[in-house]
């Protein structure tokens, strides 16, 4: 099955979700969706 | 603007394959995966699996195993799911879509306008 | 498999009252405190449409009227003044872990 990376860096700041998580290039794979950080 | 676009409808027997284009137009095709969604006549979603554009890599739902293919084209921006062995109670209508990451400041979903499979001797 | 349970099946209300619809899921679909857990619409003849994501997060373009509630295993979506176009079948979804599963959908319609 499929391999991938689904990293969810994030911090709360009052209680609203702010998400660090890196920019997603064509160079890294696939957005998978639905998901925090999940390229295929 | 984004486009999912699929084949047209089909009708199977018993036993046969049939497989199922989504060509995918509005965007870099690699850079989103490809899901698969069917809905038999008058029932509920069912998740079939995804494929990557980028790497070819596919996810499939275990119920599916050994039945369903998903592959890609990328010279074409096309996608291919190919579902074998085919019974009555896979006539349904064949969705594609992609998916932004719950991280992407946005979210939304795009579909295709769905491929009616019907399997009939 | 995490199965999704979705009730009621089907929910007549009039114009301009609320509507609520309730998923519970086998396990929790929470992860690092999000819970993967979506809202689609679909309307007769058109696929669906994602309306709430991460259980409480609006999906684009989508009117005020429609929120989503819940964390864990238990998820609420409400939609606060229901308007003739929001007639349609709404299931919950989960993206938590493969395979992605979908509740039996709600058939909301006006009274």
């Known amino acids: 099955d499929a391999e991938f990376r689904h990293d969810s860096g994030y911090e709360v700041h009052h209680q609203k979700l702010v998400f660090f998580a890196e920019d997603v290039g064509s160079n890294k794979g696939a957005i998978i969706g639905l998901m925090v950080g999940g390229v295929v | 603007q984004v486009q999912l676009v699929q084949s047209g409808a089909e009708v199977k027997k018993p036993g046969a394959s049939v497989k199922v284009s989504c060509k995918a137009s509005g965007y870099t095709f690699t850079t989103y995966a490809i899901h698969w969604v069917r809905q038999a006549p008058g029932q509920g979603l069912e998740w079939m699996g995804f494929?990557?554009?980028?790497?070819?890599?596919?996810n499939y739902n275990q119920k599916f195993k050994g039945r369903v293919t998903m592959t890609r084209d990328t010279s074409t921006s096309t996608v291919y799911m190919e579902l074998s062995s085919l019974r009555s109670e896979d006539t349904a209508v064949y969705y594609c879509?992609?998916?932004?990451?719950?991280?992407?400041?946005?979210?939304?979903?795009?579909w295709g306008q769905g491929t009616l499979v019907t399997v009939s001797s | 498999d995490i199965v999704m349970t979705q009730s009621p099946d089907s929910l007549a209300v009039s114009l301009g009252e609320r509507a609520t619809i309730n998923c519970r899921a086998s396990?929790?679909?929470?992860?690092?405190?999000?819970?993967?857990l979506n809202w689609y619409q679909q309307k007769p003849g058109q696929p669906p449409k994602l309306l709430i994501y991460?259980?409480?997060k609006q999906g684009t373009g989508v009117p005020d009227r429609f929120s989503g509630s819940g964390s864990g295993t238990d998820f609420t979506l409400t939609i606060s003044s229901l308007q003739a176009e929001d007639v349609a079948v709404y299931y919950c979804?989960?993206?938590?872990?493969?395979?992605?599963?979908f509740g039996g959908g709600t058939k909301v319609e006006i009274k």
């Open positions: 396990e929790s679909v929470d992860n690092d405190r999000i819970s993967f």
């Open positions: 879509a992609r998916f932004d990451n719950y991280d992407r400041g946005y979210v939304r979903d795009y």
């Open positions: 494929t990557s554009p980028y790497s070819g890599v596919s």
């Open positions: 991460a259980a409480t």
């Open positions: 979804s989960q993206s938590k872990e493969f395979p992605w599963s």
